[in-house]
């Protein structure tokens, strides 16, 4: 897609398997052609996307993107759930597919599973 | 434009592993899903699990949890799928396909594997 | 997980007619984000399937004119308005909101 429109590069249905206790960069990729927009993260709580205010975020620069992170620090088990953002652009809404962040809280885990284990049973981490 | 090519034709004895592969071209893998459907001589489709290239998640239907893993190497633009346990009604031809990740604007399937399971 | 149900079985047409085919899903397809993902297939005798529609209604790059999709919900049809030589297949319908992907059993459109 080459247009001069702003997008937001999240997959649809993607997810991250993370641990409580660790640091965690959510990533919102952006491309815009003259002025970056304003980007913000929201919660999905049901339909409703509750805007996350007071968090610390940053932007880091690429050749032909630039990325509005989402700093986890450290992972809560209550920052399980689904994430969205949204860019601001000649005053419409963009908006991300959503991401999700399955939580695995190591206190109640035995020991941490493989990777191979929580990509293939999301079901299994915290919920 | 994206074309998948998919390994050769395997014949398996029961109990055995196949590992089928499929490279992409065309594209930056990191943006898109691949997944793997099969084909019963015969039958219709059935999805197998996809993977997500960029972090190596992978998701599977019931029927091949624990069975089935599918992998992706990005150096290289190449998925992966093996299957394990091999049994008689495991012969299929094995798809691969690629799709976009953001808006599904593309979706395109490799030539197919067929797997002769055979003791 | 969905069950998705096609009809006819087998569809049996001349060249120039036009082909309706059905595709009824066992809960709704529409996603949270407002799209339908549900998609149409061709496959021909000893080839891989390939897409023709998506988002039910939203033409592949390269597929003619005649070929339509439209639906909503948990009932979906692929039209061909003037069937040509080239068009008879296997027809599949397969979704894409939930996990897993599921696939209807297939139509087969043959000559009359």
């Known amino acids: 897609k080459e247009s001069c429109d702003v997008q937001l590069y999240i997959k649809r249905q993607s997810y991250h398997s993370i641990f409580a206790g660790d640091p965690f960069k959510l990533e919102c990729p952006v491309k815009y052609c003259a002025h970056r927009p304003q980007v913000t993260w929201c919660k999905l709580n049901g339909t409703t996307c509750v805007k996350l205010e007071g968090r610390h975020t940053s932007w880091k620069q690429e050749k032909n993107l630039s990325f509005f992170i989402l700093h986890f620090e450290p992972v809560l088990p209550s920052d399980n759930g689904s994430y969205r953002c949204s860019a601001n652009f000649l005053s419409a809404i963009i908006e991300s597919h959503s991401t999700t962040l399955y939580v695995t809280d190591v206190k109640s885990a035995s020991e941490r599973p493989s990777k191979d284990e929580m990509a293939s049973r999301p079901w299994l981490l915290y919920s | 434009q994206v074309q998948l090519v998919q390994s050769g034709a395997e014949v398996k004895k029961p109990g055995s592993s196949v590992k089928v592969s499929c490279k992409a071209s065309?594209?930056?893998?990191?943006?898109?899903?691949m997944y793997w459907v099969r084909q019963a001589p015969g039958q219709g489709l059935e999805w197998i699990g996809r993977?997500?290239?960029?972090?190596?998640?992978?998701r599977y239907a019931q029927k091949f949890q624990g069975r089935a893993t599918i992998t992706a190497d990005e150096s290289t633009s190449t998925a992966y799928m093996e299957l394990s346990s091999l049994r008689s009604e495991d012969t299929a031809v094995y798809y691969c396909a690629v799709y976009d990740g953001y808006y599904e604007s593309f979706d395109v399937w490799g030539q197919g594997t067929l797997v002769t399971v055979s003791s | 997980e969905i069950v998705l149900t096609q009809s006819p079985g087998t569809l049996s047409v001349s060249p120039g007619e036009r082909a309706t085919i059905s595709c009824r899903s066992s809960q709704s397809l529409l996603d949270s984000d407002g799209k339908t993902y549900l998609n149409w297939l061709q496959q021909k005798p000893g080839q891989a399937p390939r897409r023709l529609i998506y988002l039910v209604s939203k033409r592949d790059t390269g597929v003619p004119d005649r070929f339509s999709g439209s639906g909503s919900g948990t009932d979906f049809t692929l039209t061909i308005s003037r069937v040509e030589p080239e068009d008879f297949a296997v027809y599949y319908c397969w979704q894409g909101t939930l996990f897993p992907r599921t696939f209807g059993q297939g139509t087969k459109l043959e000559i009359k």
């Open positions: 065309g594209v930056n893998i990191k943006d898109t899903y």
């Open positions: 993977i997500d290239p960029a972090n190596g998640y992978a």
